[in-house]
Structures are given as C-alpha cells and as structure tokens.
C-alpha cells in the first residue's frame, strides 16, 4: 500500500519542517490517491490489453464520469474558485459509486483499491472544510447509485475490464486537472 | 524519439503580431499529463516562461504579457502555436517550446525535451 | 506569482571542486523544483525533476534536495563540460517562474 499522508517517502527529510497548512494536507491527499491509483493501473494493464484498447468510445458512452470542462470554472480561462471547488467536490462525489465498483476488481491490489477509496472520501473532507458554498454542492441520489452499481457489475467480462481501465483513466485525469486548479487558489 | 522545432518570422516590426509554431513529434497532445510551454530568452540574459497548453485545453499564460498572448493547438497536426500582439524591441529574444511532462503518478511536471529555439528580432 | 531568487549569480571553480547552488522560493512549492543546464548556443537541458530525481542520462554527480521553500543543486566532482549556466524552475503554479540563473565557468 502507498505511503499515508503525511509520511511520504519522497519527502527529502526535514526534522524542522512547519505542520502541513490545510492546502499541503489537499495537496499531498491527492497525490496519495494517484500514487494508488498508479498502482491498480499497473495490475489493470499486466492483466489485459485495455490499456493499448483503441475501442475505448465504445464503453465510455455507458460511463457518465466526471469531467473537467471550461464551464466548470477550474481552467485558467474564467477561472471561479468557487465554482470550481463546488466542480471538483461534486465530481469526486460522482466517482465514488465507480471505485465501489473497483473493490472487487483486483487480486493483488485489493488494499490499494480500499486504499483509494477511503483517502478520496477523506479529500472530500478536506475540501468540503475549504468550501463557502456547500448548498450548491449535490450529493448523488444513493438509488440512482446501486442501481448503476448492479448494472455494472452485471457486465460480460470484457466489458468489466474496459469499465475498470475507464474508470481509473478517468479518474487520474479528473484528479490531475483537480490539482493543478487547487494550486491556483 | 522526441523532437520540438520551433519556426517564426526571423524579422518584425513593432506593433506587428509575431506568429510561431512549435511542430513536435514522438509523443501526442492528447495523452494525458501532456502539454507544450513556449519559453523565451533575450541574448545573454535568463529563461521567461510565457505560455503553456495542456492536454484538456487549459491554457496558461504569464500575467504579465497576458493580454498579448494566444496559445493554441493542432492535436492532428501534433502542432502548438503561440501568437505575441503588437510587438516591441523587448521582445527581440530567442523563443523555445518545450514538453512538459507530468513525471511520477503525482500532479509534477517537468520540461524534459526542447526544441532549439528559433531568433526573432522586432527592429524598424 | 512565486519568486525564485537564485544563487550566487557566477561560480568560478577548478575541475573537481564541489560546487552548491541555491534557490529559494517566494512561497511553498512543495517539491515542484526542476534544475536545467544551458550550454553556451544550446537549449536548456533537465537534469532534476521533483526537487530531487536525476533525470534519465544524467551522471550522478549531479544531485538535488529540498522541499518547500529553500532547494539545493550540487555538482560533486565539476569536470570540464559542467561549463553552463543552471536554472531552478518552479512547476508548482503557473506562472512557471525561473531562477536568474547561475554562470559556472571553470578556471
């Protein structure tokens, strides 16, 4: 499993150094939960050839994964603090029916996937606690959720492997896009 | 393997616009953790960033020649253009576009390939 | 925007000195640093990325530490080709900031 936050092995050793300010805590979440989401790519790519897929559309119609767009205000053209914030908690609350679906994915990485999925839930937290408008923050409808849940789960083989290499791409991205906007607050 | 070259006009005038284009091969702007910053050097002096494009679109600019700036980009073409309004002698450097990369599975990035620049003078 | 004040500006030294540079940020950049070497009529080459990463190729004399604010680039054994000047990067927020730039020239 990764290192936890807060004992990051790539850290250079600094017996001295300041507690981590509310955006460092943010910061080195996210980049916990990329360094698992790495290593369950890594199992997902050894396992099949989703990853060199060229027939990826196909799938990603069926997915409604959160994105980042210029409207969402987390580019720097019409950057909105505030709107983008509301984007990245609500897109992060959008996958956590997905990595429920990643738990029973994996062999070797079963850990790092609980991992994942409990550090996203504790960056939510985080930025819920850095948000002034949490009204317009919409929670997802927890029915709409188990029913795409079962019907995920109820997919042929194939299509599971291509939903779990979706999802994973996806979410690196939506959290990669996610950082580089928090940085700019 | 990776490669970047730049090209411009050589020559301009104040108050024209300068258009450049950074033709790159060995890698595709629309793979995720991609992007491509145009950076310039003056003769002898230090390195100013100036503009970067990202895989998604997002276009980042330096504050200060913002208002002048326009960063575009042909993924088919695997091209990346950055256009400077109404220039001035201060702007007589050499412009270079480098990929910036994201390393590790974290949100870093780094410049690891450049071009060679390409020499604009602005003189009248 | 995040400042990089860099140092010294020159650095006169013999073949096989050590020789330290410094860079310091105007505020946090975590490890977000690159180190470059820029030969005279060259572009600008990466050596360290993520503060402290030698990147591919790179010989191991060169090295980098920090986190933060205050990071360190380190040259162990300096050989004849060293000749350059080496910039600091910040790649933690745009605008991407570098450092004046440190001129080693060899005795």
């Known amino acids: 499993a990764p290192v936890p936050p807060g004992e990051d092995s790539k850290d250079v050793a600094a017996p001295h150094r300041q507690p981590l300010t509310s955006s460092e805590r943010i910061d080195k979440q996210i980049r916990y939960i990329l360094d698992g989401i790495s290593a369950l790519r890594k199992e997902t790519c050894n396992k099949s050839n989703m990853c060199e897929s060229s027939k990826e559309a196909l799938a990603e119609n069926n997915l409604n994964l959160p994105k980042m767009a210029e409207k969402d205000g987390c580019f720097q053209s019409g950057f909105n603090e505030e709107t983008c914030l509301v984007k990245i908690i609500t897109g992060l609350l959008e996958f956590e029916v997905y990595l429920e679906y990643l738990q029973n994915r994996f062999e070797s990485s079963e850990e790092q996937a609980r991992a994942v999925q409990m550090s996203t839930k504790v960056l939510i937290q985080f930025l819920q606690k850095k948000a002034k408008n949490l009204d317009a923050i919409t929670t997802p409808d927890p029915t709409t959720n188990a029913s795409l849940l079962t019907k995920l789960q109820a997919q042929n083989q194939w299509l599971q492997d291509m939903t779990t290499h979706l999802i994973l791409r996806s979410f690196k991205e939506f959290l990669q896009s996610s950082l580089r906007a928090l940085r700019q607050m | 393997q990776v490669k970047l070259e730049e090209s411009g006009p050589g020559i301009l005038q104040p108050s024209q616009t300068l258009s450049l284009t950074c033709s790159f091969s060995?890698?595709?702007?629309?793979?995720?953790?991609?992007?491509v910053s145009w950076i310039r050097q003056p003769s002898g002096k230090g390195l100013e960033w100036l503009a970067h494009i990202y895989w998604d679109d997002d276009k980042h600019y330096n504050p200060s020649l913002k208002s002048r700036l326009t960063i575009s980009k042909d993924t088919s073409t695997n091209q990346v253009f950055l256009k400077i309004t109404s220039v001035d002698t201060a702007d007589t450097a050499t412009y270079f576009c480098?990929?910036?990369?994201?390393?590790?599975?974290?949100?870093?990035?780094?410049?690891?390939?450049w071009g060679q620049g390409t020499s604009v003078t602005v003189s009248s | 925007d995040i400042l990089l004040t860099q140092s010294p500006k020159f650095l006169l030294v013999s073949a096989g000195d050590r020789v330290t540079i410094t860079c310091k940020a105007s505020?946090?950049?975590?490890?977000?640093v690159s180190w470059y070497q820029q030969k005279p009529g060259q572009s600008p080459k990466l050596l360290i990325y993520?503060?402290?990463n030698r990147y591919t190729g790179v010989p191991d004399r060169f090295t980098g530490s920090g986190y933060g604010t205050d990071f360190t680039f380190t040259i162990s054994t300096v050989q004849a080709e060293d000749l350059a000047v080496y910039f600091c990067q910040q790649d933690y927020r745009s605008p991407f900031t570098f450092g004046s730039g440190t001129k080693l020239e060899i005795k």
């Open positions: 060995g890698f595709s702007l629309s793979t995720s953790g991609m992007g």
């Open positions: 480098a990929r910036r990369s994201l390393y590790g599975n974290w949100g870093d990035y780094a410049m690891d390939y």
């Open positions: 993520y503060a402290s």
């Open positions: 505020q946090s950049v975590s490890t977000d």
